[in-house]
């Protein structure tokens, strides 16, 4: 930091601002009677170069001229773009201990002349806005560069504004502060930008425009929508616009959508009727404006109006299924289940369901409303029953869906054949089948139904089902399918008044079970041993168990155990074996097998048969 140049002066030739690649000569001169006090000949002038306040070079070797003890000239080259500081210091060589004393300094700026400004673009926001222009300045000059924006137009209209660029601010936009009015709509205006700095100047090409070219209307405001007769599909969108607007663009979409519906409206005067809205749907609406049909620019989009369309009565039909169980000698319990309508069918908040159960011949009718998606009733086992369900919102009810209550697995001739279940990936199972061989009535549809093979409440854990057309023989089930859980899957073939079904077990992913069955008892009856067990707890099965294995060997024997493999049936919890010798102590245990492998062994039990085996 140099306060004042008391000891001397520093000058630069040709100038303190030079083009990139040029050299400069820096002269450092001592004022009269300044310098080292006793021996002027011992005066040594040195030049130090600083970039960003950091000393980068001592230019001692760049001296090109020297008046011993009075002045020195140094040549500097290869200066980088921007500003470089040079400081001249006096070094009194007889006094080694004193540091050099600053004499004076100079800043040299290296830069380039400005390029002609390009891509001039002018806008006036709204009819009452002011004209602002922006441009591309071209390459950075590294020097303070002044820009002048000049506008000329009809009736000797002239106007200009200035700004500058340097290393702290950039000038590429100016607001002229004048307003062009619609009565000048046909007039032509010319703007040009001139750039000037210490190394030169340049001018843009003239840019010509009209009022319509540059005026961008303000975006519409105060947007609202009025639904005609509380309709969920028809509404009138209304808004405020600037007076000169002749064209609007409307865009609207449901909030969860990714594509807009676009509409152009000419001379809309702030009003437009929409007829294709979805009832009970959150929509976002935006509007843009233009002052001329062919020319001019669109305004920015307005702020969004977000609103929900009103409800309309539900459409579509409910997907109904049921479960039938005899609960005493002459009564059955019918549990009806149905799937919720999707939003485009519900068209509102479903308030309740209307359920009807009717005995066709005696005309007995049970009716109720429920807010749940299931309904259970006890009815006589006799008679032909039909059920119907409809969904109601605040505007009305859907058409009732009817289903005949038949014995779902009552007709063997309607049972589908060759049912298989194959795991496709972690969360679905492919079920395939062949049609019934000798159905005496046509299959109207197939229902694939599945339930987890683990304890559940009949009403809290409803079945999952898929309706399949009669010409399809496969279904990919994925709803509520979890890995490592075994599902019982039924394929129902339904005719008008009968049903037949086939069952299979399946899982989407399996592991070997965590443990084997627990042997609870071994009893001897008629020269046979009966092994009884408790099943593996459901969480430990880890898929569908294919079979159990009972192992036995003589106690203390090192031989391989013998084994008996039993097809897994949940209802079975004991099995006879008859190849054990009497009065020999055996060790027995069990394992379980899934498609992934065998479980570790369950508990061991010792038993010594008493009777005559075989």
């Amino acid at each position: 930091n140099i306060d004042v140049c008391k000891l001397g002066t520093v000058t630069v030739q040709p100038a303190p601002v030079i083009p990139l690649g040029s050299a400069a000569n820096i002269s450092c001169s001592l004022n009269p009677k300044q310098g080292c006090s006793h021996y002027p000949s011992s005066n040594e002038l040195i030049l130090l170069k600083f970039v960003n306040d950091v000393l980068v070079e001592n230019l001692h070797g760049k001296k090109v001229h020297d008046h011993t003890g009075h002045s020195s000239t140094f040549q500097v080259t290869n200066l980088s773009l921007g500003m470089t500081l040079f400081v001249c210091k006096l070094n009194c060589s007889n006094s080694q201990k004193k540091p050099p004393v600053p004499v004076c300094g100079v800043e040299i700026s290296v830069g380039v002349a400005p390029e002609p400004p390009q891509n001039i673009s002018c806008v006036q926001e709204g009819e009452n806005g002011t004209v602002a222009c922006s441009w591309n300045s071209g390459k950075v000059t590294y020097l303070k560069t002044n820009y002048t924006l000049q506008l000329s137009g009809p009736n000797n209209l002239t106007c200009q504004k200035q700004c500058f660029s340097d290393n702290r601010q950039n000038c590429n936009r100016l607001d002229l502060g004048i307003n062009l009015s619609p009565d000048l709509a046909e007039s032509r205006f010319i703007v040009r930008v001139t750039a000037i700095n210490d190394l030169g100047n340049s001018s843009s090409l003239p840019h010509t425009f009209t009022f319509l070219d540059i005026v961008i209307p303000l975006p519409p405001w105060d947007i609202r929508i009025n639904f005609l007769n509380a309709s969920g599909s028809r509404g009138t969108l209304q808004w405020e616009d600037e007076g000169q607007v002749v064209l609007n663009q409307l865009r609207y979409q449901p909030l969860n959508s990714t594509s807009w519906n676009m509409v152009n409206a000419t001379n809309a005067k702030g009003k437009y009727d929409l007829r294709d809205l979805r009832p009970f749907t959150e929509y976002e609406f935006q509007i843009s404006s233009k002052l001329h049909l062919s020319g001019g620019s669109w305004s920015n989009w307005s702020e969004s109006l977000r609103t929900r369309t009103p409800e309309e009565e539900p459409v579509g039909i409910l997907d109904i299924w049921y479960m039938k169980q005899d609960i005493d000698y002459d009564r059955q319990q019918i549990s009806l289940f149905w799937k919720s309508l999707n939003p485009s069918e519900a068209r509102g908040k479903i308030l309740h369901y209307q359920v009807t159960l009717q005995e066709v011949t005696k005309k007995t009718t049970l009716q109720n409303t429920t807010r749940h998606t299931s309904w259970t009733r006890v009815i006589p086992r006799t008679g032909a029953w039909t059920a119907s369900v409809s969904a109601a919102n605040s505007k009305g009810a859907s058409a009732p869906t009817h289903i005949n209550i038949v014995d779902l697995c009552g007709t063997g001739l309607l049972a589908p054949h060759q049912v298989s279940a194959k795991s496709e990936n972690m969360d679905n199972i492919l079920v395939t089948w062949q049609p019934p061989k000798k159905a005496d009535s046509a299959v109207r549809e197939y229902i694939v139904e599945w339930r987890a093979l683990q304890p559940g409440s009949i009403t809290k854990f409803p079945p999952h089902w898929l309706r399949i057309p009669p010409d399809n023989m496969s279904a990919l089930i994925s709803e509520n399918i979890k890995p490592y859980i075994c599902y019982e899957i039924r394929v129902h073939a339904l005719s008008e008044s009968q049903g037949g079904c086939s069952s299979i077990r399946g899982d989407s992913k399996h592991k070997a079970p965590v443990s084997g069955p627990h042997i609870t008892a071994i009893t001897e009856k008629k020269e046979r041993l009966f092994i009884s067990w408790t099943h593996i707890p459901f969480p430990e099965q880890r898929g569908c168990i294919l079979h159990y294995r009972i192992y036995w060997k003589e106690r203390d024997s090192t031989a391989q155990p013998e084994l008996c493999e039993i097809q897994y049936r949940r209802s079975q919890n004991s099995h006879p074996i008859s190849s054990l010798q009497p009065r020999v102590t055996y060790v027995l245990w069990m394992t379980a097998v899934t498609a992934a492998g065998e479980s570790p062994q369950g508990n061991e039990r010792e038993f010594c048969p008493q009777g005559k085996a075989n």
């Epitope: 169980q325 749940h372 683990q454 409440s457 949940r570």
Partner: nanobody
Framework: QVQLQESGGGLVQAGDSLRLSCTAS????????MYWYRQAPGKQREFVAY???????NYLDSVNGRFTISRDNAENSVYLQMNSLKPEDTVVYYC?????????????WGQGTQVTVSS
């Protein structure tokens, strides 16, 4: 396994009331559908009332309006409030629970409680 224990039976006059209780214990996490049945000597067991997980109830026609089934989930209990009892209500009342595994319904029964209504 699930164990069911009934209580509350007894001898009452026609027109009186009784409240039967049934408490469930054991593996009851999936027991939501609870029933009352009754059985007279030499007759088949008949359904009286049930209550579902969603507290939907249904009754045998002859007891509808006189009997009310209710439940207390915190106590794992189900109740049968019997009003305006008649001599023909004299039978053994059984508590029943049903749960489903796959498509098989497992049933659990209490040991029964005797209700006697004298005229």
């Amino acid at each position: 396994q699930v164990q069911l224990q009934e209580s509350g039976g007894g001898l009452v006059q026609a027109g009186d009331s009784l409240r039967l209780s049934c408490t469930a214990s054991g593996s009851i996490f999936a027991i939501d559908d609870m029933y009352w049945y009754r059985q007279a000597p030499g007759k088949q067991r008949e359904f009286v009332a049930y209550i579902t997980a969603t507290n939907s109830a249904n009754y045998l026609d002859s007891v509808n309006g006189r009997f009310t089934i209710s439940r207390d989930n915190a106590e794992n209990s189900v109740y049968l409030q019997m009003n305006s009892l008649k001599p023909e209500d004299t039978v053994v009342y059984y508590c029943n629970a049903k749960q489903i595994v796959g498509f098989q319904i497992d049933e659990y029964w209490g040991q029964g409680t005797q209700v006697t209504v004298s005229s």
